[in-house]
């Protein structure tokens, strides 16, 4: 059967009819559904959530919806014994505490199980020392600290400001650095746009607002008990002792009220430059300890949390394909939220049960997508994508011979200013396409496409007249699915203007003024960036779901390697004397690249040359086009870091949320100059260009002519 | 055979502007990436701009960042130079020239045969 | 100025060898493909060499290119009247993402 054939309609009229069934008024009353109570993973109130989509998504068509299960570590306050921090005097008094829960906004007083602000997975103790102000606590943060300045934060209690790279990889750092507890707190500087009210009259963060969030160094490995494997009933768990990615010190977070009492009296070092200032009135000293008349005074941090298995629940849907059934097309976001989660994630959970309903109603009718698509509402995201990694484990093996794509659907909006686009470069020229035919929702763009409102907001810094498209890192529920599987990802949302807001995240994020109003009232109240998301995310699905030909271009592959092998020779040459010394080159790379360059553009000839009408052939180019991104998988991962497999993107090792490219060899180079075996040192970097150069040519090889 | 044949060029006053056009035949044009070269009277060649194969991802020469604009229409095999700003400096002979190996440049298997661009008052 | 530095000129009798020294840097030559073009008076630049030193089909074996560390060679044995001509090194560099040539030398057939 053609596709024509399978799917009744012709295929532009397929994707019109699609998208002309999205409606901004639905995605509206689907967010508002989902915000009204919390829906913390492990609850009964994420369960029936999940049950309650399950029973919609029957209703809009899909061929079959189903919960699965698992058992996996979670986090979670203890309700008789709170957390908190104290500073005490001399004599062991508390004479002040921090607060214990969030002042909950207007209208929602009364509602219950509103988790107070924690760290999940944080240790229990009740460590107490001088502190010491760490900054954003990043590595250059540490090396600036400990190097520069002398400063020894052993036996201290780091307090950190929120924002620029993963809370996880600011424990980290600091566990490294000696540290006996971890602060966290939202400096205004970051979370506070200036010019705008805290919420409930703005969309800033008040002075009692705390972000939540999990700690950990998981490293893509899923349930920290059951890494490689899926938590199901016969799993064999580790004991804690041996759990991945849990942090060893206690960490608490904390809103910028109670950051103002501890900073107010820091002594010690004053900060080394501007760079290290945010905006409370204090004086930003670095320390150890508290100034002259409140020498005396210690910190102490107060963390009952426990952590326990408990149950979770994904909802995955399927839309039988009508030609190649056993090719998926994933869309995938989660459910769970910290507290209400206005933004994150019900703004995308809304905008994918709307995409669901489109997809069902053109079912109705009598259409088929070419391939199946797989919808996942995910589960246990917020500690430590648990949900999508868990079930990805579990099907790997159908995954890795089927997978075509996943696309990602966690919050539609961080901001209303344009969009914001991560993914393979696979799909570039899918995004470029797309977003082309789409009209832009943004102020002065009216009649104009999204693609020229995007590239005017946001250029390309390195290809004039395209608009920016970000490498994938992590923090999301596409993780598993690119850096371990190998399978071609993307996600797209609505962003803010980068150039003049400096806060990291939405001002909001992970706190309890997250609801509905915060969306409706400040962000989109004609929730027309919403559906703007609906369209690109739906769109990139339906693509590559009905497509003849998968809508993948080889040669964009060839241009970044080129980029990324010119950015890391770069990195390295910085170090010329060390490379003539252990004779380190590029060349083997240079060359793989050069030959994937070459066989990349002779199969894109082929490919539009072949008989399309020939189903082998087809089939044959299409799993060419699929299994690419599979190739840059090397299965014995990066180098202590097993579940992350792509030799080209990983999450960099210190800021989870951002990608690198050529991981293997940029950590192999970083900070290389401080390496006491620098032998050693230097022949790992030759080692991971090997790897990387293997991997180029290998992938490249698989689009030769197979025969 | 693979032809490529440029035009637009002429006589333009110092920051007036021109678009030079290459039409191209013979290969999958999309699967290659296409660079404008110059030579100035006498002297030696310039690279200028490239665009690569696939979506069209753009590299200037210093000398002309932000005033020239490379582009391409892969359905009508055609590439094009827009140049504002125009200096006297940029009087030359255009050269359109396709890539040998694919979507990023690495050498220049076949070339133009020019067209000369003056910059006077 | 170009960042690959040839020598202006070089001349030989007919039936000699001349070679012409192309001149860069690590992020140049030192690890890139080097390519040559000969530009007869008047005509468009032909490639003469690529890949440091294969041939495209049509150009005689009396043309060859060699690259060590950061230079590269082009050599012309045989000469002959209609070898007279500018000739350009050519590579990308890694560190403009931009292709660079040489400053060209010109090859003048004496007698």
């Known amino acids: 059967k053609s596709s024509s054939e399978a799917t009744n309609i012709t295929p532009k009229h397929n994707m019109k009819a699609f998208l002309d069934e999205l409606k901004a008024e639905n995605i509206k009353k689907f967010l508002h559904n989902f915000t009204q109570i919390p829906h913390l993973a492990g609850t009964e109130q994420n369960f029936q959530l999940a049950k309650q989509i399950q029973s919609q998504w029957k209703e809009f068509g899909l061929d079959s919806v189903e919960l699965t299960h698992y058992d996996v570590l979670l986090s979670y306050p203890n309700k008789t014994h709170p957390n908190y921090i104290s500073i005490i005097n001399e004599d062991g008094n508390e004479i002040f505490n921090t607060s214990l829960f969030e002042p909950p906004p207007a209208g929602y007083e009364n509602v219950s199980d509103i988790v107070p602000p924690f760290s999940a997975f944080s240790p229990q103790g009740m460590p107490e020392g001088d502190l010491v102000y760490v900054n954003y606590a990043r590595t250059e943060d540490f090396f600036k600290l400990e190097r520069d300045m002398k400063i020894n934060c052993s036996g201290k209690i780091v307090i950190a400001r929120y924002g620029k790279v993963f809370r996880g990889n600011k424990v980290k750092n600091a566990q490294l650095a000696g540290a006996t507890g971890v602060i966290l707190y939202s400096d205004p500087d970051d979370y506070f746009a200036p010019g705008v009210k805290s919420y409930p009259d703005g969309w800033n963060l008040p002075g009692g607002g705390v972000q939540r969030g999990n700690i950990l160094n998981l490293n893509g490995a899923g349930d920290p008990l059951t890494p490689g494997y899926p938590a199901n009933e016969y799993a064999y768990r580790r004991g804690m002792a041996e759990a991945v990615g849990l942090p060893s010190i206690p960490v608490h977070p904390i809103g910028y009220y109670d950051a103002q009492k501890l900073l107010e009296k820091m002594g010690g070092s004053a900060s080394p430059d501007s760079s290290w200032r945010g905006s409370l009135k204090v004086p930003y000293n670095v320390g150890p300890g508290f100034t002259g008349n409140f020498s005396t005074q210690k910190v102490k941090m107060h963390i009952h949390s426990t952590s326990e298995v408990t149950r979770i629940y994904n909802v995955i849907g399927t839309l039988r394909g009508a030609v190649e059934p056993d090719r998926y097309v994933i869309l995938g976001g989660h459910r769970d939220s910290w507290v209400f989660g206005g933004i994150d994630p019900q703004s995308g959970a809304a905008v994918v049960h709307e995409i669901v309903r489109s997809f069902g109603m053109l079912k109705k009718e009598g259409w088929r997508p070419r391939r199946t698509i797989l919808f996942a509402s995910w589960d246990a995201e917020e500690f430590g994508l648990l949900g999508s990694t868990e079930w990805a484990e579990e099907n790997s093996r159908l995954l890795q011979e089927r997978g075509v794509a996943y696309i990602n659907a966690d919050s539609s909006i961080e901001g209303n200013y344009t969009l914001r686009v991560d993914c393979t470069p696979l799909m570039y020229s899918l995004v470029y396409n797309l977003t082309k035919e789409l009209e832009s929702p943004d102020e002065g763009f009216e009649g104009k496409s999204l693609y020229e409102s995007w590239t005017k907001k946001s250029p390309s810094p390195e290809f004039s007249g395209m608009p920016r498209i970000s490498k994938l890192g992590s923090g999301n529920d596409f993780e598993v699915f690119f850096q371990r599987l190998g399978i071609a990802s993307g996600r797209a949302r609505y962003t803010k203007n980068w150039e003049t807001n400096k806060f990291s995240s939405y001002p909001l994020y992970h706190s309890v003024y997250e609801t509905y109003e915060l969306v409706e009232k400040f962000y989109d109240p004609m929730f027309k960036y919403h559906l703007t998301v609906a369209q690109v995310r739906g769109g990139m699905v339906f693509e590559l779901a009905n497509s003849v030909v998968l809508p993948f271009d080889c040669r964009d592959y060839a241009v970044v390697l080129r980029k990324y092998a010119d950015k890391i020779y770069n990195i390295s040459m910085k170090h010329p004397q060390e490379m003539k010394t252990y004779s380190v080159s590029f060349d083997s790379l240079f060359s793989a690249v050069k030959n994937f360059t070459e066989i990349a553009s002779k199969f894109s000839e082929r490919l539009r040359d072949f008989d399309k009408s020939n189903p082998i052939l087809l089939r044959m180019m299409n799993d060419q086009l699929m299994f690419l991104e599979r190739a840059f998988i090397d299965p014995l991962g990066l180098p202590d870091r097993p579940f992350y497999r792509h030799v080209i993107y990983a999450p960099s090792s210190h800021n989870k949320y951002a990608g690198e490219s050529f991981p293997g060899i940029y950590d192999a180079l970083f900070d290389i100059e401080s390496k006491v075996d620098p032998s050693q040192a230097w022949g790992e970097v030759k080692r991971q260009i090997s790897i990387a150069t293997f991997t180029v040519q290998a992938a490249a090889e698989t689009l030769s002519e197979v025969a | 055979e693979v032809q490529l044949v440029e035009s637009g060029g002429g006589l333009v006053q110092p920051g007036g502007s021109l678009r030079l056009s290459c039409a191209a035949s013979g290969f999958t044009f999309s699967s290659y990436a296409m660079s404008w070269v110059r030579q100035a009277p006498g002297k030696g060649l310039e690279w200028v701009s490239a665009?690569?194969?696939?979506?069209?991802?753009?590299y200037y020469a210093d000398s002309v960042k932000g005033r020239f604009t490379i582009s391409r229409d892969n359905s009508k095999n055609t590439l094009w130079l827009q140049m504002n700003s125009l200096r006297a400096e940029d009087t030359a002979v255009y050269y359109c020239a396709k890539d040998g190996v694919g979507a990023t440049p690495y050498y220049f298997d076949y070339w133009g045969q020019g067209t000369l661009v003056t910059v006077s008052s | 100025q170009s960042v690959l530095t040839q020598p202006p000129s070089v001349s030989a009798a007919p039936g000699q060898k001349v070679t012409i020294s192309c001149s860069g840097s690590?992020?140049?030559?030192?690890?890139?493909?080097v390519s040559w073009y000969q530009q007869l008076p008047g005509t468009a630049p032909k490639l003469l060499i690529y890949?440091?030193?294969k041939r495209p089909s049509g150009i005689p074996d009396r043309f060859s290119g060699s690259k060590s560390g950061t230079s590269a060679t082009l050599g012309i044995t045989g000469l002959q009247t209609g070898d007279e001509a500018d000739y350009y090194c050519?590579?990308?560099?890694?560190?403009?993402?931009?292709?660079?040539f040489g400053t060209g030398t010109k090859v003048t057939v004496l007698g």
């Open positions: 890949d440091n030193n």
């Open positions: 690590s992020s140049n030559i030192g690890n890139n493909y």
């Open positions: 050519g590579t990308w560099d890694s560190s403009l993402s931009a292709y660079v």
């Open positions: 665009i690569s194969g696939g979506i069209g991802s753009t």
